[in-house]
């Protein structure tokens, strides 16, 4: 008789999830000498232990602590780039500006980027059919709790000037319900962080509005100011030119506003 299996609203665990996590870990530790000491099989065991055999709506940050401990990594605290709803450009930027780091440039972020996973209560099985959706099912699911945990730690580590890339094409440029708005903003440490600088990325070529005056940006400024952190904002009118100028700062066209 086939065992009854919970049907969730979200997509199931990414195909070959364990193999993908292990392979990414090996690749990352080969590329980053400071993480060569990491034992990828133990990392996978800790990752597995956070969600296997547990109800996928009952996951806690505590479940991920063994993994957090194994993945402890020091990044320059003044070189952190946060992002919201504009991941691809943020990653393209740190690929060029190699001394700046998004969460996905760290081991734990790199392991889990774009993956989905969940288990089932009281079985050692990974659920490849469906996983809980944050809105429709539950917020304390393995993926959401993982990103909440690593995002909080990443924000807590930041110092000096912290940059955040925001998507100017969205109706809410700053969204209080995003990971940035609900986790990272509230975990920046005022005693370490002097300024949060927002880069608002424009979508349309002819868009010359000052999106730093957008009501949601003003809301972000208010939240940040109340936390005794300074706020500044820049429009990035031409993201393609912006990346080009990061690559070739000597280019004569890079002296004008981008």
């Amino acid at each position: 008789v086939p065992r009854w299996r919970q049907q969730w609203s979200g997509p199931g665990t990414t195909k070959r999830f364990p193999e993908t996590v292990l392979a990414r870990c090996v690749k990352y530790t080969e590329i980053h000498p400071e993480m060569r000491h990491v034992d990828c099989q133990s990392v996978w065991d800790a990752f597995k232990g956070a969600f296997i055999s547990k109800h996928p709506c009952n996951i806690t940050e505590e479940d991920y602590q063994p993994l957090m401990k194994l993945g402890t990594q020091t990044v320059p605290c003044n070189k952190i780039l946060l992002w919201s709803r504009i991941k691809d450009l943020a990653h393209q930027f740190t690929q060029v500006q190699r001394d700046m780091f998004t969460l996905e440039d760290t081991l734990l972020g790199y392991l889990a980027d774009d993956l989905t996973w969940c288990g089932e209560f009281n079985t050692s099985k990974i659920n490849y059919q469906s996983c809980p959706d944050w809105r429709k099912d539950c917020s304390n699911n393995p993926v959401s709790v993982f990103w909440k945990t690593v995002s909080r730690r990443f924000a807590e580590a930041a110092c000096d000037v912290v940059h955040v890339m925001l998507n100017g094409s969205r109706s809410k440029i700053f969204d209080k319900n995003s990971t940035f708005g609900s986790v990272e903003v509230h975990n920046l440490q005022p005693e370490k962080v002097q300024t949060l600088e927002a880069w608002v990325i424009h979508g349309g070529r002819e868009d010359s509005r000052d999106l730093c005056q957008d009501p949601t940006i003003k809301e972000l400024e208010s939240i940040i100011s109340k936390r005794n952190i300074q706020f500044s904002c820049k429009n990035i009118y031409r993201p393609d030119k912006f990346l080009q100028c990061v690559k070739n700062p000597e280019d004569s066209s890079c002296t004008s506003e981008i």
């Epitope: 364990p18 292990l22 034992d39 990828c40 296997i52 050692s124 990974i126």
Partner: antibody
Framework: QVQLVQSGAEVKKPGSSVKVSCKAS????????FSWVRQAPGQGLEWMGR????????NSAQKFQGRVTITADKSTSTAYMDLSSLRSEDTAVYYC?????????????WGQGTLVTVSS | DIQMTQSPSSLSASVGDRVTITCRAS??????LAWYQQKPEKAPKSLIY???SLQSGVPSRFSGSGSGTDFTLTISSLQPEDFATYYC?????????FGQGTKVEIK
């Protein structure tokens, strides 16, 4: 039908090395991990280490670190265990055993065992 | 390392008896526990995985239970071919560790 066939018995002098092989057939070699477990005469089972062939990574129990090297050759579907600086306490039957990469299950298949005798 | 402690270390029983072997982990291992049967001069054979799931081809008289730190292997009605040594093993973390074994002998 999955089979793990190990190399034959060995008699070694203290201080020397031994290399035991484990050839897998009847399954996808790269989809699994291979562990080495030993059993001294009249004693229990002791896990030595594990290799994941498709990643080329291995780890071993701290007790054996620096003495054991676990490798795999994907082209011949063979896992190897090399134990150096042998002493009399290493006299044991050495088993290879297969598990899934995610290790969400047990060792489902075992080799027949290889007796290694260390004696001067 | 996680220590696995089995009890008893040996027991005598008759054909048809109900036999229970326990295994305790020194820290929580969820349900990442396997049971193996080993006969003299033979390789171990997997009986139970995930604490309570029966390996295919294993008779239903074998069952496993437990989660966290305390686990049990039960043979509901001992058969002549069941006289052997039984080992528990955790696969929650490295290094993988086994219990010291329980020898089931004929009374």
């Amino acid at each position: 039908q999955v089979q793990l066939v190990q190399s034959g018995a060995e008699v070694k002098k203290p201080g020397s090395s031994v290399k035991v092989s484990c050839k897998a057939s009847g399954g996808t070699f790269s989809s699994y991990a291979f562990s080495w477990v030993r059993q001294a005469p009249g004693q229990g089972l002791e896990w030595m280490g594990r290799v994941i062939p498709f990643l080329g990574i291995a780890n071993s129990a701290q007790k054996f670190q620096g003495r054991v090297t676990i490798t795999a050759d994907k082209s011949t579907s063979t896992a190897y265990m090399d134990l150096s600086s042998l002493r009399s306490e290493d006299t044991a039957v050495y088993y290879c055993a297969r598990d899934d990469i995610a290790a969400l299950g047990p060792f489902d298949y075992w080799g027949q065992g290889t007796l290694v005798t260390v004696s001067s | 390392d996680i220590q696995m402690t089995q009890s008893p270390s040996s027991l005598s029983a008759s054909v048809g008896d109900r036999v229970t072997i326990t295994c305790r982990a020194s820290q929580g291992i969820s349900s990442h526990l396997a049971w193996y049967q080993q006969k003299p001069e033979k390789a171990p054979k997997s009986l139970i995985y995930a604490a309570s799931s029966l390996q295919s081809g294993v008779p239903s008289r074998f069952s496993g239970s437990g989660s966290g730190t305390d686990f049990t292997l039960t043979i509901s009605s001992l058969q002549p071919e069941d006289f052997a040594t039984y080992y528990c093993q955790q696969y929650n973390s490295y290094p993988r560790t086994f219990g010291q074994g329980t020898k089931v002998e004929i009374k």
